[in-house]
């Protein structure tokens, strides 16, 4: 019993003056609280509480369920307690069969004893099964048995409290331990697609998958920079214990341009939060944007190859693509493919392969593409660079020597005179007349140039060279002069 210095309020005294009392079942419990300022008796066992305002607590025929802590409290709020065991051979344990534990915390198996003199008070697995090797427990006859540091692996563990009474092992009713997991990581969140492109009026639907150890994970779809609550639908599954999955699907049945933006799937648990975003772009109608991968004006040498390459964005997806030249459609020599295999890809590539181009194959090559909303095209102007070709070299009736050459780019014609039989003609002769013959003709193909000189200027035997050249190469034609007396006997042109 408590002792205090005089003058200070003191706790009540209890008779019998013991901390514990053992009573046989059926016998009387008689407890007296001695205090001038008596207020009440309180009885507690498991989660049950009873009160009595009389200073004497009397239970005429004690039962096992009268086992528990009896506390007397005075008007100063001071109290004294006695613990009473009601020994009942037929009921060794008082039990509250609900058993929940939080992972990594201790939990109490509530099976207080009605007889403190039994031995081997412990836990046993149901149906003779052993307890997990790492399960540690601490028995307390007045409270029950504490399991230390509960593990997830103990979830749904079936167990009994056990004690030896007069040499025999006695088991309590069974307990099923339910373990609540500790959140040791943030939820795992993922989204069905990172970006969406839609036309006005189309349905927007996106699914966020949230994975965690418990269904008590919080999740929501949010629109960035908006507080509006979004309508979402859920599906959820337990793929076994501590393996929970939720699918939160956000739907806008008829998307509008102003629905465009970033949508965030946010999830959190007691450990922390995670989020993932998806971007929605709503356009009023479809589009096609073409990007040439090479210059749209192409110069290529005769006999060489060239690839005309475009990339284009098309939404909705392209339905028809074609390459055209001179109103003719290519059936082969081209390929069209998506830039990536990604489901949300809107970028494509088209390539036209032109091989061993001839001078006559210059011109406009057009790529056309269409989808259900729009058409688009792009033109490439292809110029074939050709070495000049001398088409004609003649002495005209008026005594002029004329050279006509064709090539691309436009050839330049120079004239040279070689006296005697020299092969190297160095002295240049100025032309009398130079004309580009097809300047007003088609814009592609060879350009024809005509140049003339006056042959009367030549007084000696020799050779005249007509030399046509451009960036690609050069070609020459020759006129031979032979004089007999004062007359030009012959002019023999040759290349």
């Amino acid at each position: 019993q408590p002792s205090v210095s005089p003058g200070e309020p003191s706790p009540p005294s209890i008779h019998p003056a013991k901390s514990e009392l053992i009573v046989r079942v059926g016998n009387e419990i008689r407890l007296l609280c001695i205090d001038p300022g008596f207020v009440k008796w309180t009885f507690e066992i498991l989660d049950e509480t009873n009160e009595n305002k009389q200073n004497e607590w009397i239970t005429e025929k004690a039962e096992a369920t009268n086992t528990g802590k009896y506390t007397c409290t005075n008007k100063h709020g001071l109290s004294s307690s006695i613990y009473v065991f009601v020994r009942d051979p037929a009921k060794l344990f008082l039990v509250d069969r609900s058993l929940y534990g939080k992972e990594d915390n201790d939990t109490l198996v509530r099976c207080p004893l009605t007889d403190p003199e039994v031995t081997s008070y412990s836990l046993k697995g149901c149906q003779g099964k052993p307890l997990p090797k790492d399960l540690r427990f601490v028995p307390d006859p007045k409270a029950g048995i504490t399991i230390k540091s509960v593990k997830r692996a103990y979830h749904r563990l079936c167990l009994h409290c056990s004690a030896d009474q007069e040499g025999k092992s006695v088991l309590s009713d069974k307990f099923i331990l339910k373990v609540r997991p500790a959140f040791k990581a943030v939820p795992v969140v993922s989204v069905s697609k990172a970006s969406y492109l839609l036309r006005e009026g189309e349905e927007f639907t996106v699914t966020c998958t949230i994975k965690d150890v418990s269904s008590s994970v919080y999740s929501t779809w949010k629109r960035e920079n908006s507080q509006t609550k979004l309508q979402e639908k859920y599906n959820s599954w337990h793929h076994g214990d501590f393996n929970y999955e939720r699918q939160a699907t956000l739907t806008i049945s008829s998307a509008r341009v102003n629905d465009s933006g970033v949508f965030m799937c946010y999830a959190n648990n007691t450990f922390g939060s995670a989020n993932v975003t998806t971007t929605l772009e709503v356009v009023d109608k479809g589009f096609i944007n073409i990007f040439p991968m090479i210059n749209t004006t192409v110069f290529v040498n005769d006999g060489e190859n060239v690839d005309l390459i475009v990339e284009y964005e098309a939404f909705p997806k392209p339905e028809h693509q074609q390459w055209i030249y001179m109103n003719r459609t290519f059936t082969d020599k081209w390929e069209d493919y998506p830039k990536s295999e990604n489901e949300s890809n809107i970028r494509y590539v088209s390539e036209l392969h032109l091989t061993r181009l001839k001078g006559t194959e210059g011109g406009t090559y057009t790529f056309l593409v269409s989808n259900s909303d729009v058409n688009a095209s792009i033109a490439f102007n292809v110029y074939v660079n050709t070495k000049p070709e001398i088409l004609t070299y003649d002495r005209l009736v008026n005594g002029m020597l004329q050279c006509v050459a064709a090539g691309f780019p436009e050839p330049t014609i120079d004239w040279y005179f070689c006296p005697g039989t020299e092969q190297r003609c160095s002295a240049s002769v100025l032309p009398v007349d130079v004309q580009t013959l097809n300047a007003s003709g088609p814009p592609f193909g060879k350009l024809v140039v005509q140049s003339s000189i006056d042959s009367s200027a030549f007084k000696h035997n020799g050779t005249v060279e007509c030399k046509a050249y451009n960036d690609v190469g050069k070609t020459s034609a020759y006129f031979n002069f032979a004089f007999k007396g004062n007359n030009k006997e012959q002019i023999h042109p040759h290349t």
Epitope: S98, S214, S215, S216, S236, H238, D241
Partner: antibody, heavy 119, light 106 residues
Amino acid sequence: QVQLVQSGAEVKKPGSSVKVSCKASGGTFSLYAISWVRQAPGQGLEWMGGIIPAFGTANYAQKFQGRVTITADESTSTAYMELSSLRSEDTAVYYCARGGLDTDEFDLWGRGTLVTVSS
Amino acid sequence: DIQMTQSPSSLSASVGDRVTITCRASQSINSYLNWYQQKPGKAPKLLIYAASSLQSGVPSRFSGSGSGTDFTLTISSLQPEDFATYYCQQGVSDITFGGGTKVEIK
């Protein structure tokens, strides 16, 4: 033994809300899953949602999403279910039960609260 | 949602009869199936959890079996206090109950 004690019967007008309470008389209330299950006259059982008080986040059946709010007060070991925008078809006995989340079975039931919705 | 289909919806039997009630899930629910008994004006009472585990205090004449999609509740010898309505319930997805089986006296 633990008991779940529910609040008394209610009569409500269409369009209004009702809040039913469920007090647990002991045990580790914070770790319980407390669910709400309703039963219309002569009909079967319908899960509305539930909460584990220690975790604080409620789960709701799709049908009741946005119309039901389940909360728990650990200090008083009491769970609450509020149902808004009541209509006549919400007339039912509303049970609170221990279990129903994270694969827990319903091993303990309250006695039920009759909610009548009538104009 | 996972649909739970109970059959039959009602049955008449006599004391001492063996009674079998079946429950089929619209998709696999492993063994996350529970059985309840409900008497008029009372709350349901858990009989079987995890498809086949008998709840404490429930007589051993009640037994459960099955996994995946098909489950059975068996009452080996029907007693007068067993006349009631029985419900199955799955716990894999949002919780759903079967429509109930009413066991009546023949």
